[in-house]
């Protein structure tokens, strides 16, 4: 009769984390008598995964009844697979011997690779706001995935970005991997409503990528433009001067009126008008009693926005 | 030697659509000589799935080498499973005979059930807007799932709804199923920012339910409240009357001022103030030259909102 062969039909098996892995093994003969064992790895440091006759292997079940007469199927199933279970598994036939059983023949091995999903990408932006035309950095991180192959893309409002750098760690073999990417985004005045998206594609996601987002509203400061104008008034002894504060973000704004350099009134903006692009407008007016002035008056609208240095605009009111 | 038995160790196997199904079968003896075949179903109408010796079965692979001497493992793997593959599969041993091989013994059968994910739920709302305190209906649909057991829940802003009716079709056995649910939602004035969510849980989703959403902003109309007031004016010959249009949604609004029933001015609201609840406010003012009037004037602020019938508020301006 032909000498026994140990057949491991699959060279490799890929399993999703949390699932069970079936490792198949068949013998071509019932002879010689002796137990079957499964190991991970080869050589002196190999790890025993299953011993047919003794030991405790709660995660392992046999696919068929090993003690059944004429059974030649020694396939096993390992439950609740994690990335740490990856490796090459060998089905090994032993021949009974004294004092110890003797290894008789090993299968060619089945490489178990574990597919583990990446964690939800976390996108974080800059610690301080920047103004339009400046560049800010966003980072995206995801962990715990396997295999190592992964694709990361950045988008701003659906448009793919190209200025980014991505690392997958560790560089060598590992049970699972992490990805870290930094994208550089140039801010524009219209970016209050903009979003950056980090999109991760991985074999475990079955074509349904994971996305992490960040709002540019957290990263941008749009400084206001000021315009001071005089409104027509039908009453002769009064002048109505308005300060139009336009297209600023975020909300926080304090306005001070000065008459010839002296503080006349200070206001904190509350009810703002929101523009379509997410910036705000606000208008303040000053009624000036022209009877109280002999000479021309310089009216100054001074605005402090989001804790930044104040900006101002002046208007010379002619007293005729 | 004992008479040959055909062992199908699994009574049932459940596989996700797109994956491969392994159907296990082992013989307890090499005798009698004859081929093995796999069928779906029993009786005269059974479907041949695999014939060891002849025919073309591109989706079927054998788990071990069937021609190997002493092989007793006749397990097969069927690739790219779809819901249409569900059924009971029998491993059948034939004995060589003349003119035809004769069925010798059948395994007990393995029921293959196919797990197919439901499609992303699509939520649709009413065709026309309704006002607060009225009830509107939302529908949610999802298709193509298997098995039939599925759970659908409705939420409004995270609060579970109870007034809904759900059907799963068809009622009898099918390769896949569809779900249709209609929820009745009572609108409130604060619902512009509200969302209804249809949440579907199914065994294939591994505890990560699918969600479909609809915004109540598409379904609601919040009619405005009007308030007409006179503002103090320092100029004696002028009166400033304002019409405060509050808490309306959606944006579309046209305002007409009438003086003693005659149209004075018509405006279309553009720059609106958005409230926290998503409704809008707008203010219009009318400067009235009191010198031009001898008698008291009735000023009417008339508002047409979102194509609905106009509402109005009047103010009697006393000419002293």
């Amino acid at each position: 009769e032909d000498e026994l062969q140990v057949i491991q039909p699959e060279k490799s098996v890929s399993v999703a984390a949390g699932e069970s892995a079936t490792l198949r093994c068949a013998m071509t003969s019932l002879i010689p008598v002796g137990p079957i064992m499964w190991f991970r790895g080869a050589g002196a440091g190999r790890e025993l995964i299953y011993n047919q006759k003794e030991g405790h292997f709660p995660r392992v079940t046999t696919v068929s009844e090993l003690t059944k007469r004429n059974n030649l199927d020694f396939s096993i199933s390992i439950s609740n697979i994690t990335p740490a279970d990856a490796g090459t598994y060998y089905c090994v036939k032993f021949r009974k011997g004294s004092p110890d059983d003797v290894e008789f023949k090993s299968g060619a091995g089945t490489e178990l690779s574990v597919r583990a999903k990446p964690s939800a990408p976390v996108v974080s932006g800059p610690a301080v706001r920047a103004t339009p035309e400046h560049t800010v950095s966003f980072t995206c991180e995801s962990h715990g995935f396997s295999p190592r192959d992964i694709t990361l893309k950045w988008f701003k409002n659906g448009n793919e970005l190209s200025d980014f750098q991505t690392n997958v760690d560790p560089a060598g073999d590992s049970v699972s991997y992490s990805i870290h990417s930094t994208a550089r985004v140039v801010l524009t005045r219209g970016d209050v409503h903009s979003q950056v998206i980090c999109e991760i594609a991985h074999i475990t996601l079955q074509g349904d990528p994971l996305r992490g987002t960040a709002n540019l509203s957290e990263a941008i400061r749009v400084p206001p433009t000021l315009e001071v104008t005089q409104q027509p008034m039908r009453a002769e002894n009064q002048a109505n001067v308005t300060c139009q504060v336009s297209n600023f973000y975020p909300r926080g704004l304090q306005l001070t009126w000065l008459e010839n350099g002296n503080v006349s009134r200070t206001e904190t903006a509350s009810t703002l008008i929101e523009n379509k692009d997410g910036t705000y407008n606000w208008m303040s007016w000053l009624l000036v009693n022209t009877c109280a002035h002999r000479d021309d008056v310089v009216l100054t609208c001074q605005v402090e926005h989001d804790g930044q240095q104040a900006v101002s605009k002046s208007y010379a009111l002619e007293i005729s | 030697e004992d008479e040959l038995q055909v062992i199908q160790p699994e009574k049932s196997v459940s596989v996700a659509a797109g994956e491969s199904a392994t159907l296990r079968c082992a013989m307890t003896s090499l005798i009698p000589v004859g081929p093995i075949m796999w069928f779906r179903g029993a009786g005269a109408g059974r479907e041949l799935i695999y014939n060891q010796k002849e025919g073309h079965f591109p989706r079927v692979t054998t788990v071990s080498e069937l021609t190997k001497r002493n092989n007793l493992d006749f397990s097969i793997s069927i690739s790219n499973i779809t819901p249409a593959d569900a059924g009971t599969y029998y491993c059948v041993k034939f004995r060589k005979g003349s003119p035809d091989d004769v069925e010798f013994k059948s395994g007990a059968g393995t029921e293959l059930s196919v797990r197919a994910k439901p499609s992303a739920p699509v939520v649709s709302g009413p065709a026309v807007r309704a006002t607060p305190e009225h009830t509107v209906s939302f529908t949610c649909e999802s298709h193509g799932f298997s098995p039939r057991d599925i759970t659908l829940k409705w939420f409004k802003n995270g609060n579970e709804l109870s007034d809904f009716q759900t059907n799963v079709d068809p009622a009898g056995d099918s390769v896949s199923y569809s779900i249709h649910s209609t929820a009745r939602v009572v609108l409130t004035r604060g619902d512009v920012h509200s969302q209804v969510i249809c949440e579907i849980a199914h065994i294939t989703l591994q505890g990560d339910p699918l969600r479909g959403t609809a915004n109540l902003s598409e379904a609601i109309r919040v009619p405005p409240t009007l308030e007409v007031t006179q503002q103090p004016m320092r100029a004696e010959n002028q009166a400033n009357v304002t019409c405060q249009v509050s808490n309306f949604y959606p944006r579309g609004l046209q305002l007409t001022w009438l003086e003693n029933g005659n149209v004075s001015r018509t405006e279309t609201a553009s720059t609106l103030i958005e409230n926290k609840d998503g409704t809008y406010n707008w203010m219009s003012w009318l400067l009235v030259n009191t010198c031009a009037h001898r008698d008291d004037v009735v000023l009417t602020c008339q508002v047409e909102h979102d194509g609905q019938q106009a509402v109005s508020k009047s103010y009697a301006l006393e000419i002293s």
């Epitope: 008598v33 790890e47 025993l48 030991g55 003690t67 | -």
Partner: antibody, heavy 113, light 108 residues
Framework: EVQLVQSGAEVKKPGATVKISCKVS????????MHWVQQAPGKGLEWIGR????????KYAPKFQGRVTITADTSTNTAYMELSSLRSEDTAVYYC??????WGQGTLVTVSS | EIVLTQSPATLSLSPGERATLSCSAS???????LYWYQQKPGQAPKLWIY???NLASGIPARFSGSGSGTDYTLTISSLEPEDFAVYYC?????????FGQGTKLEIK
């Protein structure tokens, strides 16, 4: 449920032979090696030997070789351990165990003249 | 024959303290074949840790096992009253199988 039930306590004279049984339920004895372990009063555990009930193959510790015989009856799902030429230092609790994971309750053997 | 030597023979500690039990082998043992058992007076030993570091079913997470080659350790991070017992290490890497002499963990 896996259970290993051993026979009751024995008192023997020096030179005699004792045979302890271990009846198992919840599994087929042929599927696993059956081990026997000795524990003298106040002392540690000592491995005696094991049997493969499928083919009756045995392994023994050198200390017990020649005096111990382990057998199994697959029809009754029972393993046996026989120790001959008893001496006072054989006074101990004897345990059977299934594949190193599940243990019987122990059988006390007292050797005394 | 592989001789397993456990240290200390007796360990006196109070509940809440950390316990470290050692098991040293006279020649290398594959980590797959190193087991730990707990035994309380009048009871049969119970499998506690298998394959060096895996907790048997129902064993609390305060227990852990580690080691390789000739040196193995059982650690209890914070002792509970029910942990006081005798612990044995056991190798089944080669015949004859052997046990350590045991470490008695007693209440201080």
């Amino acid at each position: 449920e896996v259970q290993l039930v051993q026979s009751g306590a024995e008192v023997k004279k020096p030179g005699a032979t004792v045979k302890i049984s271990c009846k198992v339920s919840g599994f087929n004895i042929k599927d696993y090696y059956m081990h026997w372990v000795q524990q003298a009063p106040g002392k540690g555990l000592e491995w005696i030997g094991r049997i493969d009930p499928e083919d009756a193959e045995t392994k023994y510790a050198p200390k017990f070789q020649g005096r111990v015989t382990i057998t199994a009856d697959t029809s009754t799902n029972t393993a046996y351990m026989e120790l001959s030429s008893l001496r006072s230092e054989d006074t101990a609790v004897y345990y059977c165990d299934r594949g190193l994971a599940y243990w019987g309750q122990g059988t006390l053997v007292t050797v005394s003249s | 024959e592989i001789v397993l030597t456990q240290s200390p023979a007796t360990l006196s500690l109070s509940p809440g303290e950390r316990a470290t039990l050692s098991c040293s082998a006279s020649s290398s043992v594959s980590s797959s074949y190193l087991y730990w058992y707990q035994q309380k007076p009048g009871q049969a030993p119970k499998l506690w840790i298998y394959s060096t570091s895996n907790l048997a079913s129902g064993i609390p997470a305060r227990f852990s096992g580690s080691g390789s080659g000739t040196d193995y350790t059982l650690t209890i991070s914070s002792l509970e009253p029910e942990d006081f017992a005798v612990y044995y290490c056991h190798q089944w890497s080669s015949y004859p199988y052997t046990f350590g002499q045991g470490t008695k963990l007693e209440i201080k």
